[in-house]
Each structure stands twice: as structure tokens, then as C-alpha cells.
């Protein structure tokens, strides 16, 4: 399966000396049946390659059954003895080469896992002699060494040294966690992105790190415009402020009253609160119409009745809806200089003998100066 | 070669459920995620949801939020999409996509999709 | 939810035309949108991705631009392959929308 992997444990070979060219059994590489207590291995050199068995750990290794966690091996590395490059820039790239299928460190043995790496392992390491005619047997085993430990992962390489029964073997190892996957098990995946599905990089434990307008565990929720109501508003992209049915204003804090609410306001969406003095579903009723039109005229007393209605409470001598009209306006007699007086709905009206004018007939008409008041007159006066 | 093969569709009555899977091969299938969308007879393209193989994160369209499930197992490459209280408006092709995206960019695309596997809803 | 509006719904082009399909978004997406192609009977096809990146084996006479809300996909020179439906897609944020298409049809 496509599964790809979670991390990396990388053995890089250092050196190995295999001072007299013999294989673990005893016999020479060269198989012509001699062997170092036989006056030593000198024809024909081992042509030496390794392979590397990970495994769950164990206390007491067995050397058989299955690699669980992992096998890799490298090409013919040298003869009897030789010495590679260390482990360091050299191996990160090789490894970088290796996971994108170029050319890799022959030293280095790489095996990826995919499953959360355990800490503990063990590690077998087979030194074996390259035979053209045949394929691997326990007879071409050069040496077989084995270590049981504990490894987090990192980038810092750990160093081993094995004496064997007839090579020795120095190596180094290291635990890595694929790019995307964190922590000491390298099992927690984050692979920074900027689309709908999340808007974050990764901090180095692998936790998600919202990018700048974005919130949230997946970073998937815009954080809108500093102040914009989240009860009635929200974002789908940073920095708005769209508010819900029923609200409005820049950040969606301010409700929107019953539609043609004239004197009123809301603190639900779609309410009409009347101001003080005002009625009706629409607040267009005026509760107090004598406070602000004040009708009533010739000290009429204003009293508020139904909405948008009043009375006026007429003085002794008024009447009319706004006491508007005098009572017997003509009983004080109040035309001078002769004038006739005549009630009408207004109150009364004075007819003027010629020469008088004014409401009352007290002003005197002269021919040159105009209107001055004197003891007789001619006109009459409307009032 | 990618490849994304969908099955499990046929005939429904309203009310039922079905499942419908996307097998996935010629990728990592955790490096990516895996998106279902569906195309009415005669309509356009309509996201149903998706999952993040890697860490179960799943998210879904508000049309089939809380009827549908999005599932994965990394084991079999395999996506899967649980379909429960299914209704006529349901009826559709559903289509199962990869989805590629890269930080150094804003966006993403759906750039592997399956063949598609009909669903109909109805009595 | 962000609405992605294409147009035209359809349009009749010759081979060898030069053909502009738009599409708006409701709000900004930034650059997060996608372009697909789709035959009868076929599965979608990504041709942008990212508004103006040219996917992967597409043809390059297929183009896009735009940032924001307004986006265009351009075809320089229409080849009778290229008869099919267009659709939009903004991946800014959840949930991804689709336009509603537009079919290119030989005129």
C-alpha cells in the first residue's frame, strides 16, 4: 500500500576491518578451503557488503526471524577492511537523494517506517562476502553483530562500535521523522497549508500555527473585523463583518427595527420601542400632542386624549376646539368712538365711524401723518 | 499511475443509507487529501465534504452535515463515504478527488478524480 | 458560504478563437481558485490552479488570472478538444464552491 512512511532509522556505515579476510565460519573469502590457521587468507580479498536487519527489542537477541520493523542493505562496499565518509552532511544528503530516487551513499542504509516509532529496537548487522556463483548462505557470513537499545528521533547521529568474533564494525545510527510528522513517536502529521481545508505552518512539535487572520483547531475560521459582534455577525474571510438577518451597522451591534418605525428604536430585530410621547405599531402617535404643539390658545388648559387627539379646557368667555373664540365678545363693549360691534366666530368685529379705525376704533385717521388715536372717527374696522 | 476507483453506488430508497468508497493507488495516500463531490443530473458541481487521511480530520457541506460520514483507512488506501437519511435531492454522481495544496501558495486543487459512481434516491 | 458567479452560461466559439470565461466572487478569496474542465459523461479536469498556475500537462494556450473577487480563464486559441463545460472553484475558504459552469459549444 501507498501508506508512504513516518520516519526514517538510517545506519550509516563508518568502517570495518576484517584484518585476515575470513569469514565467520573460518574458511576464506575466496572459498579454496584454507584458513588463517592454515597460513592465513592472502589470494583473494572479501568482497564485503552489509545487511541490516530492525526488529522489536529484545533482551536476549535472536539473530533469526522476521525484520518487523524494517530491512535494507548496501551494494559491495569494499574488501577486507575499509573506511567511508562519516555520517553528517554528507548522509542527510544521500538520504534527501535516496527518498527522491537519485543516487545514494553506499554506506548508508535507509528504512523507512510506517508506524509510530517506539523508541525501542533492536538492530542486526550482517557483514556478508559477495559470491557471484551463489546465492547468500550462512557460508558467506563475515560477521553478525547485534545491539538492543533505545533511539529518539533526531537529528544527531549516534555512534557504535562492535568487535566481533573475527570483523569490527564501527557505525552510526539515527531516528528521523518524515517531513510532516512530529514528536518521539513521529506519528503526529502536519503539513502546513493555505487553503479551505486550513490556514497554518507547523511549529516544530508539529502543532498547527494559524496563519494571521485564521483561528481555530484546524485554523479554518476567519477572525473577523476587530469589534464586529460574533452574536449577530460573522466572517467566512478575515476581517469582515457580515451580520446576521436582523442586524446591522459596522459591526453588526445595532438591530433593525420593524420597517417604518418612525419615533421608535429596537433592541430585538424587528421591534418597534416607542420614545417617550409616542404610540401606535409604528411609534407615529403622538401621546403628548399638547406638550409639543401646544393648541390651545386664550389660556385654554391642554389635556391629552387618545393618540394624535387633545381637549382644551376653556377659560369663562372662550369657547371652540382651541378656545379660539370669545363668549358674548360684544357684552364689554369694546368698540370706542361709535363703532358698532358684531359677534362672529372669532370673536367680534368692530364697524367704525368714519375717521376711526383699528380692532377697537381708537385710531384716529389724519390726512398727513397717518394713523394717530384721538376722540372721533370716520371709518369703520373689521377685527 | 494515480489512480482513484469509486464504488458502492446504486438505487436507494429515501430514508436508506449506502456507502460508497474511493480506493486510492499510485500516491501516498496520507500526503493528500481525499474530497468528495457530486454532480446532480444536468447540474453543476456540488463539494460534499473530505477527509485528511493522515490525521482523521474531516469537514462537510452544511447540506449533508450530520447525515453523512467521511472516513479513511490508511491500511487499504481507502476513502469512504457513509450516507444515511438519504433524500431524492441526494441523487446524484458522486465523484471522489484528491486534493493537492502547497503553503507557498494560496488555494488548492483537486487534480485526481475517480470516475464516478451514481446514487439514486428514490421510492 | 461564498458564491462564485460565471459568465457567460454558454457561449459559441470557432476553432482557432480567442475565448474568455469570467467568474466573481461573492467576497475575496485572495488567489485561491481553481479551474476545471469537464466532457459529458467525464469527470472534472483541473487546468489552474491558484488562479494564474498552470497545471501539469495542460495545454499552455489555457491561462488564468485575477486575485480577489474577479477572475478570468483564458483559451488562446479554441481546438475542437476544448468543447466542454468550465467550471470555477474558489478553495480560499470551507466550504469550496463551484461556479455554475459555462459550456463551450462550436459555433
Known amino acids: 500500500a501507498d501508506l508512504g512512511s513516518m520516519g526514517y532509522f538510517e545506519l550509516q556505515l563508518s568502517a570495518l576491518r576484517n584484518v585476515n579476510g575470513e569469514l565467520l565460519s573460518g574458511a576464506c573469502c575466496d572459498g579454496d578451503g584454507r584458513t588463517t590457521r592454515a597460513g592465513g587468507c592472502g589470494r583473494d580479498e572479501c568482497d564485503t557488503y552489509v545487511r541490516v536487519c530492525l526488529k522489536e527489542y529484545q533482551a536476549k537477541v535472536t539473530p533469526t526471524g522476521p525484520c518487523s520493523y524494517g530491512y535494507g542493505a548496501t551494494p559491495v562496499l569494499g574488501g577486507n577492511s575499509f573506511y567511508l565518509p562519516p555520517a553528517g552532511a554528507a548522509g542527510d544528503r544521500a538520504r534527501a537523494r535516496s527518498r527522491t530516487g537519485g543516487h545514494q551513499d553506499p554506506g548508508l542504509v535507509v528504512i523507512p517506517f510506517q508506524f509510530a516509532w517506539p523508541r525501542s529496537f533492536t538492530l542486526i548487522v550482517e557483514a556478508w562476502d559477495w559470491d557471484n556463483d551463489t546465492t547468500p548462505d550462512e557460508e558467506l557470513l563475515i560477521e553478525r553483530v547485534s545491539h538492543a537499545g533505545m533511539i529518539n528521533p533526531e537529528d544527531r547521529w549516534k555512534s557504535l562500535h562492535f568487535s566481533g568474533h573475527v570483523a569490527h564494525l564501527e557505525l552510526q545510527i539515527r531516528v528521523r521523522c518524515d517531513e510532516n510528522y512530529y514528536s518521539a513517536t513521529c506519528n503526529k502529521f502536519c503539513r502546513p497549508r493555505n487553503d479551505f481545508f486550513g490556514h497554518y505552518t507547523c511549529d516544530q512539535y508539529g502543532n498547527k500555527a494559524c496563519m494571521d487572520g485564521w483561528m481555530g483547531k484546524e485554523c479554518k475560521e476567519a477572525v473577523c473585523k476587530q469589534g464586529c459582534n460574533l452574536l449577530h455577525g460573522g466572517c467566512t474571510v478575515p476581517g469582515e463583518c457580515r451580520c446576521s438577518y436582523g442586524w446591522q451597522g459596522k459591526f453588526c451591534d445595532e438591530c433593525v427595527p420593524y420597517p417604518g418605525c418612525v419615533h421608535g428604536s429596537c433592541v430585538e430585530p424587528w421591534h418597534c420601542d416607542c420614545e417617550t410621547n409616542w404610540g401606535g405599531l409604528l411609534c407615529d402617535k403622538d401621546l403628548n400632542y399638547c406638550g409639543s404643539h401646544h393648541p390651545c390658545v386664550n389660556g385654554g388648559t391642554c389635556i391629552n386624549a387618545e393618540p394624535d387627539q387633545y381637549l382644551c379646557a376653556c377659560p369663562d368667555g372662550y369657547l371652540g376646539k382651541n378656545c379660539e373664540r370669545a363668549e358674548h365678545a360684544c357684552a364689554s363693549n369694546p368698540c370706542a368712538n361709535g363703532g358698532s360691534c358684531h359677534e362672529v366666530p372669532s370673536g367680534f368685529e368692530c364697524h367704525c365711524p368714519s375717521g376711526w379705525n383699528g380692532p377697537t376704533c381708537a385710531l384716529d385717521i389724519d390726512e398727513e401723518f397717518g394713523l394717530v388715536p384721538r376722540g372721533s372717527g370716520h371709518h369703520h374696522h373689521h377685527h | 499511475e494515480v489512480q482513484l476507483v469509486e464504488s458502492g453506488g446504486g438505487l436507494v430508497q429515501p430514508g436508506g443509507s449506502l456507502r460508497l468508497s474511493c480506493a486510492a493507488s499510485g500516491f501516498t495516500f496520507t500526503s493528500y487529501d481525499i474530497h468528495w463531490v457530486r454532480q446532480a443530473p444536468g447540474k453543476g458541481l456540488e463539494w460534499v465534504g473530505g477527509i485528511s487521511p493522515a490525521d482523521g480530520d474531516t469537514d462537510y457541506a452544511n447540506s449533508v452535515k450530520g447525515r453523512f460520514t467521511i472516513s479513511a483507512d490508511t491500511s487499504k488506501n481507502t476513502a469512504y463515504l457513509q450516507m444515511n437519511s438519504l433524500r431524492a435531492e441526494d441523487t446524484a454522481v458522486y465523484y471522489c478527488?484528491?486534493?493537492?495544496?502547497?503553503?507557498?501558495?494560496?488555494?488548492?486543487?483537486?487534480?485526481?478524480w475517480g470516475q464516478g459512481t451514481l446514487v439514486t434516491v428514490s421510492s | 458560504d461564498i458564491q462564485m458567479t460565471q459568465s457567460p452560461s454558454s457561449l459559441s466559439a470557432s476553432v482557432g478563437d480567442r475565448v474568455t470565461i469570467t467568474c466573481r466572487a461573492s467576497?475575496?478569496?485572495?488567489?485561491?481558485v481553481a479551474w476545471y474542465q469537464q466532457k459529458p459523461g467525464k469527470a472534472p479536469k483541473l487546468l489552474i490552479y491558484s488562479a494564474s498556475f498552470l497545471y501539469s500537462g495542460v495545454p499552455s494556450r489555457f491561462s488564468g488570472s485575477g486575485s480577489g473577487t474577479d477572475f478570468t480563464l483564458t483559451i488562446s486559441s479554441l481546438q475542437p478538444e476544448d468543447f466542454a463545460t468550465y467550471y470555477c472553484q474558489q478553495s480560499y475558504t470551507t466550504p469550496p464552491t463551484f461556479g455554475q459552469g459555462t459550456k463551450v459549444e462550436i459555433k
Open positions: 467576497q475575496d478569496v485572495s488567489t485561491a
Open positions: 478527488a484528491r486534493n493537492d495544496y502547497d503553503v507557498r501558495s494560496v488555494g488548492s486543487g483537486m487534480d485526481y
